[in-house]
C-alpha cells in the first residue's frame, strides 16, 4: 500500500475492510481485548492499537484481511506523527493560552463528560 | 474547591477564569511553552498539562488565579481517570470491533486530518 494515500481515504477504506472482515475477526470469540468504557477515543489510542495487535496475532493472515491490518498500522503511524507534533513548537504564552482555551472549549462542547 | 463540582461546570468556570486572568498570565513575555500544531487536542493532553505546570511555576499565586490552577489540576485528574478507563475492561472481540469502528468513524468525520 503506498503511504502516499491520503489519511482520510485510508480511514474510509479501513472502515469498509473492517465491515467486510468482521465475521472472520469475531471467529475468535473467547479472546479478551481492552475496550474503553467511554467515547473520548483520542485518549485511548494506545490501548486501541494494542488491541489491534492482539487481534492481528490471533487472525489468519492473507488476502484483504492483511490489507486491513496494514491500513491500521498506517493509521497508527499517522497518529504517532500527530502525537509528536504535540510538543514540537515552543511558543509564547499568548499562543499557549489560545490553544488551552480552544482545548477547554472543545472539552466543554464536544467531549462526552460523565460526572 | 469541592471535587464534587460536575466536570462540565468545572470546565465552564475554568474558561471564564482563563479569560479573566489572561493579562496577568501573558505578562511573562519571554517564557516559551510547547504549543501543539494541530487541533486534535485529546492527543496532546500530556503536553498541555506540562505547559500549564510551566505557566503556574512562573505565575504569582493568590486570589482567583490560584483557583484557575486548582481547577486545571482537577480537570487533569478527570482526564487521568478517563485514561485509566481505556484499558480497565477486557471484553470480547465483538465489543472491541464496535469500538474500533466507532473510533475510525469519528476519525473520518470529526478529526482535522492533514495528509
Amino acid at each position: 500500500i503506498p503511504t502516499e494515500i491520503p489519511t482520510s481515504a485510508l480511514v474510509k477504506e479501513t472502515l469498509a475492510l473492517l465491515s467486510t472482515h468482521r465475521t472472520l475477526l469475531i471467529a475468535n470469540e473467547t479472546l479478551r481485548i481492552p475496550v474503553p468504557v467511554h467515547k473520548n477515543h483520542q485518549l485511548c489510542t494506545e490501548e486501541i492499537f494494542q488491541g489491534i495487535g492482539t487481534l492481528e496475532s490471533q487472525t489468519v493472515q492473507g488476502g484483504t484481511v492483511e490489507r486491513l491490518f496494514k491500513n491500521l498500522s498506517l493509521i497508527k503511524k499517522y497518529i504517532d506523527g500527530q502525537k509528536k507534533k504535540c510538543g514540537e513548537e515552543r511558543r509564547r504564552v499568548n499562543q499557549f493560552l489560545d490553544y488551552l482555551q480552544e482545548f477547554l472549549g472543545v472539552m466543554n462542547t464536544e467531549w462526552i463528560i460523565e460526572s | 474547591i469541592p471535587t464534587e463540582i460536575p466536570t462540565s461546570a468545572l470546565v465552564k468556570e475554568t474558561l471564564a477564569l482563563l479569560s479573566t486572568h489572561r493579562t496577568l498570565l501573558i505578562a511573562n513575555e519571554t517564557l516559551r511553552i510547547p504549543v501543539p500544531v494541530h487541533k486534535n487536542h485529546q492527543l496532546c493532553t500530556e503536553e498541555i498539562f506540562q505547559g500549564i505546570g510551566t505557566l503556574e511555576s512562573q505565575t504569582v499565586q493568590g486570589g482567583t488565579v490560584e483557583r484557575l490552577f486548582k481547577n486545571l489540576s482537577l480537570i487533569k485528574k478527570y482526564i487521568d481517570g478517563q485514561k485509566k478507563k481505556c484499558g480497565e475492561e477486557r471484553r470480547r472481540v465483538n465489543q472491541f470491533l464496535d469500538y474500533l469502528q466507532e473510533f475510525l468513524g469519528v476519525m473520518n468525520t470529526e478529526w482535522i486530518i492533514e495528509s
Partner: antibody, heavy 111, light 107 residues
Framework: ESGGGLVQPSQTLSLTCTVS????????VNWIRQPPGKGLEWMGL???????DYNSAIKSRLSISRDTSKSQVFLKMNSLQSEDTAMYFC??????????WGQGVMVTVSS | DIQMTQSPASLSASLGETISIECLAS??????LAWYQQKPGKSPQLLIY???SLQTGVPSRFSGSGSATQYSLKISSMQPEDEGDYFC?????????FGAGTKLELK
C-alpha cells in the same frame, strides 16, 4: 453475599452481592465458586454498562443481573445438582483480575 | 478453554526458605496471569497481576515471573503467615480459568 444455604436438587439458586464503596456503573462484578476442598471456577460477570458474559459450561443455567440503585448484583442458577455445592464469591474485576472479593456464601445442594 | 496446570500440588517449607510455584498454560496467555493466596475459610487475595506486578499492600517477598505459557510465583523468605493455598489465573481468553492450587505449609 447473601442467599446461601440448603437448596433442593433441580431447584433454582438465588444469590445477592451487595457492594459498598464501589459504584456498579463504573465497576464490573464477577461470580466465582469453589466446591469444598477444590479449586476456583469462574461463572460469569456483569460489566459496568450492564452487559453480561458467562462461562459457556454453565451459560444455559445462569443469569446475572443488578440493581444499581441498591448497589446489588444478583446470580440466578437453575436445575441445581449436587456438583453445584460450593462456596460462592462475588468479586470486582479490574483489568481481568479479581482485586476485591466478598466473604463468600456456602450453598449445599441436597435433598 | 485454556487449561492451567499448577505444580506442585502441595509444598512444605521451613521458615526463611525460598519457594517457587509453577503454572503452565495450555496455550500462550501473553502475561495475562494473576496469583492469589487463600487462607482457610477466607476469600482469595490478589498477590500478583500481569505476571509480575505486585498488588498494593502485598509484601515484597512475593514476586512473579514468566511469559508465553510458563509462569512462576516466588516467595523469597517463607513466613508463618504465608501458609495457605495459592492459585494462578489466566484472563487472556474467556472463560477465565484457574490452576488447581498449591497447598503451602510450614515445616
Amino acid at each position: 453475599e447473601s442467599g446461601g444455604g440448603l437448596v433442593q436438587p433441580s431447584q433454582t439458586l438465588s444469590l445477592t452481592c451487595t457492594v459498598s464503596g464501589l459504584s456498579l456503573t463504573s465497576n464490573s462484578v464477577n461470580w466465582i465458586r469453589q466446591p469444598p476442598g477444590k479449586g476456583l471456577e469462574w461463572m460469569g460477570l456483569i460489566w459496568s454498562n450492564g452487559d453480561t458474559d458467562y462461562n459457556s459450561a454453565i451459560k444455559s443455567r445462569l443469569s446475572i443481573s443488578r440493581d444499581t440503585s441498591k448497589s446489588q448484583v444478583f446470580l440466578k442458577m437453575n436445575s441445581l445438582q449436587s456438583e453445584d455445592t460450593a462456596m460462592y464469591f462475588c468479586a470486582r474485576e479490574y483489568y481481568g483480575y479479581f482485586d476485591y472479593w466478598g466473604q463468600g456464601v456456602m450453598v449445599t445442594v441436597s435433598s | 478453554d485454556i487449561q492451567m496446570t499448577q505444580s506442585p500440588a502441595s509444598l512444605s517449607a521451613s521458615l526463611g526458605e525460598t519457594i517457587s510455584i509453577e503454572c503452565l498454560a495450555s496455550e500462550g496467555i501473553s502475561s495475562y496471569l494473576a496469583w492469589y493466596q487463600q487462607k482457610p475459610g477466607k476469600s482469595p487475595q490478589l498477590l500478583i497481576y500481569g505476571a509480575n506486578s505486585l498488588q498494593t499492600g502485598v509484601p515484597s517477598r512475593f514476586s512473579g515471573s514468566g511469559s508465553a505459557t510458563q509462569y512462576s510465583l516466588k516467595i523469597s523468605s517463607m513466613q508463618p503467615e504465608d501458609e495457605g493455598d495459592y492459585f494462578c489465573q489466566q484472563s487472556y481468553k474467556f472463560p477465565n480459568t484457574f490452576g488447581a492450587g498449591t497447598k503451602l505449609e510450614l515445616k
